[in-house]
């Protein structure tokens, strides 16, 4: 929006005649104390719209706040608008007069307000008092606005000085009421019930002497009304309850119940609403997915949690390898279910220090008397691997052949690799890898067990090497998901009178 | 404050054209709005066109596509090319200037625009 002139205050002759033109992308219109003065709308050659607002005959009673807005706002991403402020001084005109209501001001906390004494010229001196008293309050004064702070129940004028004479508005009336605010809060004993059980529903509202409590609720659509009790609490003043009280729950009243408190004495009213859930018969059912397979590192801790809903509340066991599981007096196992709200439950089982024998086929089952589910996984304990040996040996054939033996969980993978420079690899020059079939020179052999007992992967490797001619560092490495151990040997040809 | 004198009304047929201009006493190329208004007889002074500072000019439904206004800053001018004349454009036609800082408008003096059918 284009506004000519642009403002944001203007001050203007009294008598004289001033032209607003306001310009944009759709059609605008003024607007002065919410209603549409008379105005030419109009559109330019670019295309865009205009209003143009002419005030003829200007006085002090068209002092005031002027808007320019689009005509109709929907559909625009902005809902702009434009503020001019207009002054006429004017000293026929003392304070712009004030809607009756304006004079009242009622207060229900402690909270700035404007005392709305306007006037026309904004080089006038204005100035706030107590009706009673001639002493000039320090209250801030906006001339399009009038005195903005926090007051007392008192009544308040403000004065001026037009030429030579003293000008009062009307007094202004500040009232505090001592009425809180309604504040309602809506309980149920459970929000999920199974047919036949009861329903219990608690509308509390604090600080409040007198009100009244309305229900409503699925069985009141149906012409089946059900009568609530109300009580004081004593012990906390001013809090009232209103209790619902259904027996015997049927599905039909599943939905929402909304529980409405007015007080009469200033109108004030809130309500609030509950879901309700009625169920045929109780449930459990697995929130989120837990893979059949899960890891768990040695010597580490490990927690696996279980999410799910259930109604009525679920007894929950654990198994290993169809044996039940329960909190271990060693610390070693710790369970417990807890429940994160009123039908959502997570049951975790922490192993401590995990170690090799509590790999197995766990199953978690939860279950009452109207359902049941179970999760099973199997866990498996991941092992860092180890070379348990590295040793190097002179076969009658006359080639020489490097053994390496390791162990790990999940089966570890062999890396054999050599440096032939033994001064500058493998800090300058990289090893070279060993075991390649189109290499002649070495010649690989492994072989991979799995022990049972220990749950985990043997891995043997042998190195047939062809010729050595001079001292070579032959290093096994051992990789897996949790780790990777190397050893290195000197080989030195069948020629040479020592070996390191 | 500037004074406005306007010239170039008279008797004319309908469909026939007319010019009116709008002579300022000093330089009009700092107003901010300048335009032009006419009072037909019995009736409230009503816009026809007016030209914003920003160069936008806008005219009122009626006369759209039939009447032009013009400015000419060097010669201190406002005009108002008036074509296919109908009698309801019979009327006093006022220029106008304004300017936030004179606090209000200026008039000339009109000039009376007649046409017959």
């Known amino acids: 929006l284009v506004v000519t002139p642009p403002g944001p205050e203007l001050v203007l002759n009294v008598s004289s005649t001033f032209v607003l033109t306001c310009s944009g992308s759709a059609p605008v219109v003024w607007e002065r104390m919410s209603q549409e003065p008379p105005q030419e709308m109009a559109k330019a050659q670019d295309g865009t719209f205009s209003s143009v607002l002419t005030l003829t005959n200007l006085t002090g009673l068209d002092t005031g706040e002027y808007f320019c807005t689009h005509n109709d706002s929907r559909g625009l991403e902005t809902d702009e608008r434009k503020r001019l402020y207009i002054f006429v001084p004017d000293p026929t005109v003392g304070f712009l007069p004030n809607d009756a209501e304006e004079l009242f001001i009622f207060l229900t906390e402690i909270t700035e307000i404007t005392i709305p004494c306007r006037v026309t010229d904004p080089q006038l001196v204005v100035t706030l008092h107590e009706k009673k008293g001639d002493v000039a309050l320090p209250v801030p004064y906006d001339h399009q606005r009038g005195f903005s702070g926090i007051f007392e129940d008192r009544s308040y004028i403000c004065k001026t000085t037009i030429g030579d004479r003293e000008v009062d508005s009307d007094a202004y009336y500040v009232y505090r009421l001592q009425v809180s605010s309604i504040n309602v809060s809506v309980n149920a004993v459970q929000t999920v019930v199974r047919q036949g059980e009861n329903i219990t529903l608690m509308c509390i509202v604090i600080g409040n002497e007198v009100v009244n409590f309305e229900w409503t609720y699925p069985r009141k659509e149906s012409g089946r009304l059900v009568e609530p009790v109300t009580d004081f609490l004593l012990d906390m003043p001013y809090h009232i309850r209103s209790i619902l009280h259904i027996p015997s729950a049927e599905l039909e009243d599943s939905g929402t119940y909304t529980c409405n408190v007015t007080e009469s004495v200033n109108d004030h009213q809130d309500e609030k609403a509950i879901n309700i859930t009625v169920v045929e018969s109780g449930y459990v059912r697995l929130l989120g997915e837990v893979g059949t397979l899960q890891f768990a590192e040695l010597h580490r801790s490990r927690t696996l949690q279980v999410v799910f809903e259930a109604y009525p509340p679920p007894t929950v066991l654990w198994f290993k390898d169809n044996r039940t599981l329960g909190d271990s007096s060693a610390g070693e196992i710790a369970l417990s279910t807890r429940n994160v709200s009123e039908t959502r439950y997570v049951s975790e089982l922490t192993l401590v220090r995990v170690k090799v024998a509590e790999a197995g086929h766990y199953t978690m089952r939860a279950f009452h008397e109207d359902a049941e589910v179970q999760l099973s996984f199997q866990l498996q304990i991941n092992v860092p691997v180890r070379v348990l040996e590295l040793s190097e040996s002179h076969p009658d054939s006359g080639e020489q052949t490097v053994r390496c033996r390791g162990r790990g969980m999940p089966q570890p993978n062999i890396i054999w690799s050599a440096c032939r420079d033994l001064k500058r690899c493998p800090r300058e020059l990289p090893p070279t890898l060993l075991g390649n079939s189109s290499e002649e020179e070495s010649q690989l052999e492994t072989n991979v067990t799995y022990w049972e007992e220990e749950q985990e992967f043997e891995v043997v490797s042998t190195l047939r090497l062809q010729h050595v001619d001079r001292p070579l560092s032959v290093r096994c490495t051992l990789r897996n998901a949790v780790g990777q151990d190397t050893q290195e040997v000197i080989v030195v040809p069948h020629s040479l009178p020592f070996k390191v | 404050e500037v004074q406005l004198v306007e010239s170039g009304g008279g008797l004319v047929q309908a469909g026939g054209s007319l010019r009116l201009s709008c002579a300022a006493s000093?330089?009009?190329?700092?107003?901010?709005?300048m335009g032009w208004f006419r009072q037909a007889p019995g009736k409230q002074r009503a816009l026809v066109a007016i030209n914003t500072y920003g160069g936008r000019t806008v005219y009122t439904n009626s006369v759209e596509g039939r009447f032009t206004m013009s400015r000419d800053s060097a010669k201190n001018m406002v005009y108002l090319q008036m074509t296919s004349l109908e009698p309801e454009d019979t009327a006093v036609y006022y220029c106008?200037?304004?300017?936030?800082?004179?606090?209000?408008?200026?008039w000339g003096q009109g000039t009376q625009v007649t046409v017959s059918s």
């Open positions: 106008y200037a304004q300017t936030t800082a004179w606090r209000g408008g200026v």
């Open positions: 000093e330089s009009i190329s700092s107003i901010e709005q």
